[in-house]
Amino acid sequence: QPSVSPGEPSPPSIHPAKSELIVRVGNEIRLLCIDPGFVKWTFEILDETNENKQNEWITEKAEATNTGKYTCTNKHGLSSSIYVFVRDPAKLFLVDRSLYGKEDNDTLVRCPLTDPEVTSYSLKGCQGKPLPKDLRFVPDPKAGITIKSVKRAYHRLCLHCSADQEGKSVLSDKFILKVRPAFKAVPVVSVSKASYLLREGEEFTVTCTIKDVSSSVYSTWKRENSQTKLQEKYNSWHHGDFNYERQATLTISSARVNDSGVFMCYANNTFGSANVTTTLEVVDKGFINIFPMINTTVFVNDGENVDLIVEYEAFPKPEHQQWIYMNRTFTDKWEDYPKSENESNIRYVSELHLTRLKGTEGGTYTFLVSNSDVNASIAFNVYVNTKPEILTYDRLVNGMLQCVAAGFPEPTIDWYFCPGTEQRCSASVLPVDVQTLNASGPPFGKLVVQSSIDSSAFKHNGTVECKAYNDVGKTSAYFNFAFKGNNKEQIHPHT
C-alpha cells in the first residue's frame, strides 16, 4: 500500500493487501476497504460498473463474471484497487463480442481471462484459418487483446481469443471485426450535366453522384448565394465494402426565370470537402439565333462553287430546316448537323453547297429554321460575276452603230476606230448615247448596257471595234467600212 507523509490524506488500504487475487469459482470473495473516510467500492469489467457503499465487499459464491477490478475510494477522491480473477475451468474468457476498429488505430478484442496462469494467450482465425500476416496484437489478461493498427483488409475478419489451459487449447466465442475506414481523400463528386437550358414551366432535375468509403459522407445541394434548403432525393448503393455511392437528385418541378443560376453539389468527410456545379438558365420562351459564317452578300465567278454556311442556336431543338431559292426548296445539296455531340448542345450548322454556278443562278438564297416556339431566317444575296457577252451589234437606219452587251458587274463599252487594215484600234471614239437597259429589272443576273456612235463621222475605210469589258473579262465586235466614191458601200459587222 502507498505510504504518505502525515497530515496529507492517504489512499485507502485493501485487505488482502495484494494487487491481484485468484479465487476458485464457487468460493467467497471478501475484500475489506480500510479508511476512516470510506465512500464506496466500485467493480469494473468489460465497461460494466457496479457500486457498493459497504466497506466490505462480499461475494459468497464467486462466478467467472465476478472477475474484474475492485476499487475502493475515500472521501478525498483517493483510491486503491485489487484485481480479482475467478478461475472457472468452464469459462476461461469473459467476452463482449462487439468488435469495431477504426482504420490505422488500435482496437481491443474484449476477452479478459478468468485465469492469469494460462499460457499462449493470443488470437486465432476462425475455422483454423490463419490470421492476416501483417496482423499484430498485444495480449493483456485483464483487458483483452489489442490489435495494432487495424487495416481495412481486416473488415469482417472472424477470430477467437485463444489460450492453453492445462495443455489444451481453449477458444473464446467468435468475434467479427468491423473496420470503420479512415477517410483518406475528399469525396468524389460529379454531376449529370454541367449546364441546363429550360423554358419556363419545364422540370429541372439534376443528379449529383457522390462516391466515398462510407455512407457517413455528408452531401447537399446548395444554390450559390442562397441559404434556402433545396428539396433533394437520394438513392444509395454499397458496391462492396468501402465503396459507397450516393445519387442526390435535385428537382424543381416547374422552373421559373428567377430559378436561373448556379447550383452546387457539396460533399465533405473528415478529410475534406469537394464540390461540383451546374448552371441553370430558364428562358421565358424558346429562341433561334442565326449567325452567318460568310458575308450575306456573295460574289462568285461564273462556273465556280460557293458554300453558304450558317451557324445557329436553337432552343428547343430545331424541327424544320430548309434552303430556298426563287420560291423553290432545295431537296439536296445541303446538310444540317449539330455543332457538337454534347447532350446539352444547342448550336447547329447548316451548309448549302452551290456548284458550277451559272450567270442565271444569282439571286437570294434563304435559310429558314423553326422549332416549337419560333421561326427564323437569313438571306444570302448571291451575285454571279460573268464576262460580258455582246448581244447585238447593228447599223441603225439613222446611221448609228449600236452595240448591246450583258454581263456582271455592269460592262463598260468603249469604241475604237482602226483606219485601213490595221489590227490595233487605238483611236477611241466617244459614244453618242449610253444606256443601262435593265436597271429597273431584277436585282440579280446580268446587267445590259447599250452604247451607240454616229458612223457618219468615219470618212475612210477601216474597222470600228465595240469592246465590252468588266472585272471578269472583255469581248469585242467589229464593223468594217468600205467606201466607193462618196458612198459607204457596205458595213460588215463581225466579232
Epitope: 469482417r156 470503420r180 455512407s215
Partner: antibody
C-alpha cells in the same frame, strides 16, 4: 454485455415532435452504427436512418428525409432520434439497433419505445 | 429503393418439420442479406448475417443461403421456440426489410 437502453413510452399530439433516446452500456459506442427502426402495430419493420458517432453524419431513409433528425453524444454513449410533424400514422414502436450502416447487420436491439400520436 | 419480397407471408408447421422461407430482392444485393426472428412484443433478433453466416449463440438448425437476388432461410427441424415472425433485410441500398413470414403451429 452491451445493452441498448431506450427512453420510456410517449403520447404526443399530431403536429408535435418526439425525441427518443438510446443509451449504450459498454463497448466502443463511437464506432457503432446506431440505427432507428420502427414498427407500426401489426406491421413490418421500417428503417428510418442511422449514425456512426465517430463520423457524426447521419443517413436517413428517403421517406423520413427532412422530418427525422438522428444525433449521437459520444460522451454519454447515447443516440437520439427526433421525429417532427407527427401524425397518427407515426404511432409505432421505435427501436434503436446497433448496425444498419455500411452494410452492418442489426446485431443488437433495444427493447423499443412506444410512441402514440393521438389528438 | 430495393424491394424485398418474402414468401410465404405465413405458414403452418409442426415441431420437427423442415421449414424454408424465401426472400427475393428487386435487384442484386450480392450477399448483403440478413435474417431476423421476432416474437410478439419483443425486439427482433439477428439469426443470419451476410446471407449464410450464423450469428453467435443462434442454434445450428438455422441456416441461410443464396446470393444476388434469391435467398433462403431454412430451419432444419422446427422447435417450439421457433414459432415467430421472420424478416429478411438488405444492406446494399437504403435498408429495406421483407414483409415478414409468420410461422405458426399447425
Amino acid at each position: 454485455q452491451v445493452q441498448l437502453v431506450q427512453s420510456g413510452a410517449e403520447v404526443k399530439k399530431p403536429g408535435s415532435s418526439v425525441k427518443v433516446s438510446c443509451k449504450a452500456s459498454g463497448g466502443t459506442f463511437s464506432s457503432y452504427a446506431i440505427s432507428w427502426v420502427r414498427q407500426a402495430p401489426g406491421q413490418g419493420l421500417e428503417w428510418m436512418g442511422g449514425i456512426i458517432p465517430i463520423f457524426g453524419t447521419a443517413n436517413y431513409a428517403q421517406k423520413f428525409q427532412g422530418r427525422v433528425t438522428i444525433t449521437a453524444d459520444e460522451s454519454t454513449s447515447t443516440a437520439y432520434m427526433e421525429l417532427s410533424s407527427l401524425r397518427s400514422e407515426d404511432t409505432a414502436v421505435y427501436y434503436c439497433a446497433r448496425g444498419g450502416l455500411d452494410t452492418d447487420e442489426f446485431d443488437l436491439w433495444g427493447r423499443g419505445t412506444l410512441v402514440t400520436v393521438s389528438s | 429503393d430495393i424491394q424485398m419480397t418474402q414468401s410465404p407471408s405465413s405458414l403452418s408447421a409442426s415441431v420437427g418439420d423442415r421449414v424454408t422461407i424465401t426472400c427475393r430482392a428487386s435487384q442484386s444485393i450480392n450477399s448483403y442479406l440478413n435474417w431476423y426472428q421476432q416474437k410478439p412484443g419483443k425486439a427482433p433478433k439477428l439469426l443470419i448475417y451476410a446471407a449464410s453466416s450464423l450469428q453467435s449463440g443462434v442454434p445450428s438448425r438455422f441456416s441461410g443461403s443464396g446470393s444476388g437476388t434469391d435467398f433462403t432461410l431454412t430451419i432444419s427441424s422446427l422447435q417450439p421456440e421457433d414459432f415467430a415472425t421472420y424478416y429478411c433485410q438488405q444492406g446494399v441500398s437504403d435498408i429495406t426489410f421483407g414483409g415478414g413470414t409468420k410461422v405458426e403451429i399447425k
